[in-house]
């Protein structure tokens, strides 16, 4: 009878993560008596995957009944495959011996490759907000995929971006890989409602790419424009001055009125109106009792937006045209300063 050969018919097997891998092995003879063992890798550091003789291998099942002497099919199934299972598997026949079984013949090996889906891309923007016309960086990360080949694209509101750099790690062979990409985006005043999208395509996704998004509302700061105007006189000796705070984002805003450099009133924007582009408008007004002033009054609307240095706009109020009321020491009144305006 010819000497036993161990046949592993599959040079490679490709399995999706979570599925079961079947590793085929047959012997050409029933002689010699002895166990079959499966190993991952070769040489002294090889890892025992299955031992017919002894041990507990919960993920491994045999295709046929290996308990019987007349069995020559030593194929195994490994369940719940993960990328860490990738490698070359060897089916090895041992001869019954004393004091130990002796390795008799090995199969040529079967390379197990694992297809693993990338994790959902996570997009993160800059730690601090930036204003329009500035360039900001967004990063996109996805992990745990195999094989290494992967495609990553960036979009802003559906338009593909070109200014980005992508790395896949590690560079060499690995059980699974990670991708890291950084895109540069130029902000505009209209970007409050904009989205940046990172799209990852991989063989495991069957043409249905994964997307991660970042809202530019988390990144952008649109500074307000200020306009101070004097309204028609409401009553004798009273002037209504308004400060229009327009096109700002985010909403966090504090306004201070100054009369000739002295703080008259401070308030926080609450009842704001939202523009179509996502920015906000707000108006504050001040009733000035002109009879309390002998000279012209410099009214200043000072706005601190989102923790940034204050911006201001001033208005010179002429009091010479108005007769002064004696005994009045009230310079200004705060009545209905949060008037709602719709644009």
């Amino acid at each position: 009878e010819e000497e036993l050969q161990v046949i592993q018919p599959d040079k490679s097997v490709l399995v999706a993560a979570g599925e079961t891998a079947t590793l085929r092995c047959t012997a050409t003879s029933l002689i010699p008596v002895g166990p079959i063992q499966w190993f991952r890798g070769a040489g002294p550091g090889r890892e025992l995957i299955y031992n017919q003789k002894e041990g507990h291998f919960p993920r491994v099942t045999t295709v046929s009944d290996l308990t019987k002497r007349n069995n020559m099919d030593f194929s195994i199934r490994i369940g719940n495959i993960t990328p860490a299972d990738a490698g070359t598997y060897y089916c090895v026949k041992f001869r019954k011996g004393s004091p130990d079984d002796v390795e008799f013949k090995s199969g040529a090996g079967t390379e197990l490759s694992v297809r693993a889906k990338p994790s959902a891309p996570v997009v993160s923007g800059p730690a601090a907000r930036a204003t329009p016309q500035h360039t900001v960086s967004f990063t996109c990360e996805s992990h745990g995929f195999s094989p290494r080949d992967i495609t990553l694209k960036w979009f802003k509101n559906g338009n593909e971006l070109s200014d980005f750099q992508t790395n896949v790690d590690p560079v060499g062979e690995s059980v699974s890989y990670s991708i890291h990409s950084t895109a540069k985006v130029v902000l505009t005043r209209e970007d409050v409602h904009s989205q940046v999208i990172c799209e990852v395509a991989h063989v495991t996704l069957q043409g249905d790419p994964l997307r991660g998004t970042a809202n530019l509302s988390e990144t952008i700061r649109v500074p307000p424009t200020l306009e101070v105007t004097q309204q028609p006189v409401r009553a004798e000796n009273q002037v209504n001055v308004t400060c229009q705070v327009r096109k700002f984002y985010p909403q966090r805003l504090q306004l201070t009125w100054l009369e000739n450099g002295n703080v008259s009133r401070t308030e926080t924007a609450s009842t704001v109106t939202e523009n179509k582009d996502g920015t906000y408008n707000w108006m504050s007004w001040l009733l000035v009792n002109v009879s309390a002033h002998r000279d012209d009054v410099k009214l200043t609307c000072q706005v601190e937006h989102d923790g940034q240095p204050a911006v201001s706009k001033s208005h010179d109020l002429k009091v010479s045209a108005h007769p002064k009321e004696q005994g009045s020491n009230t310079a200004a009144e705060n009545t209905g300063s949060n008037e709602r305006n719709i644009y």
Epitope: E1, I31, V33, E54, K68, R69, K96, P99
Partner: antibody, heavy 118, light 107 residues
Framework: EVQLVESGGGLVQPGGSLRLSCAAS????????MHWVRQPTGKGLEWVST???????YFPGSVKGRFTISRENAKNSLYLQMNSLRAGDTAVYYC????????????WGQGTMVTVSS | DIQMTQSPSSLSASVGDRVTITCRAS??????LAWFQQKPGKAPKSLIY???SLQSGVPSKFSGSGSGTDFTLTISSLQPEDFATYYC?????????FGQGTKLEIK
């Protein structure tokens, strides 16, 4: 059903010969090692002989040179030729299959009695 | 030749008891050890092979353990049909050898 049936036992004088047979059924006979085991009345078990799939044979020192084991795969039959029999060979002789991957004995026949006496 | 020594030679136990029989080899037998049950006038029946593998069709109340030279057969809960003689056998090295047997009797 896997079955082994021994035959050929009987009374024989010391120095005589006897040929035991074992008829196998219910399995592919040629794919298994086969064994003979004996048991003197009221005593323990003693391995007597093995024949491998390829025809290789094995014996303990107590029977070597006196016993021969053979197989006829076409007839699904196992044989034990016993020569120069002694009183100490008196026992029930069992045919057994090395049915497990490691050649452990898994199936036994019912046995046949061999008595060596004058 | 490898000597196989069983202990005890006989054992009295009651139905429901857990019993353990030991078998010692005179040298390392690489776990190639089998256990058999034999009732009077019957052929031996295979219970365990390769020290701990349960033969097909054998109830799980029988279990084998051990390695190297020391092995045990355990019957977890004795039933009337379990009272018999039990043999161990090494089949690592020719000549294959058996233990002298342990007779398990009803107390």
């Amino acid at each position: 059903e896997v079955q082994l049936v021994e035959s050929g036992g009987g009374l024989v004088q010391p120095g005589g010969s006897l040929r035991l047979s074992c008829a196998a059924s219910g399995f592919t006979f040629s794919s298994f090692d086969m064994h003979w085991v004996r048991q003197p009345t009221g005593k323990g078990l003693e391995w007597v002989s093995t024949i491998g799939i390829a025809g290789d044979t094995y014996f303990p020192g107590s029977v070597k040179g006196r016993f021969t084991i053979s197989r006829e795969n076409a007839k699904n039959s196992l044989y034990l030729q016993m020569n120069s029999l002694r009183a100490g060979d008196t026992a029930v002789y069992y045919c057994a299959r090395g049915g497990n991957w490691d050649d452990a004995l898994d199936i036994w026949g019912q046995g046949t009695m061999v008595t060596v006496s004058s | 030749d490898i000597q196989m020594t069983q202990s005890p030679s006989s054992l009295s136990a009651s139905v429901g008891d857990r019993v353990t029989i030991t078998c010692r080899a005179s040298q390392d037998i690489n776990n190639y050890l089998a256990w058999f049950q034999q009732k009077p006038g019957k052929a031996p029946k295979s219970l365990i092979y390769t020290a701990s593998s349960l033969q097909s069709g054998v109830p799980s109340k029988f279990s084998g353990s051990g390695s190297g030279t020391d092995f045990t057969l355990t019957i977890s809960s004795l039933q009337p049909e379990d009272f018999a003689t039990y043999y161990c056998q090494q089949y690592n090295t020719y000549p294959y050898t058996f233990g002298q047997g342990t007779k398990l009797e009803i107390k």
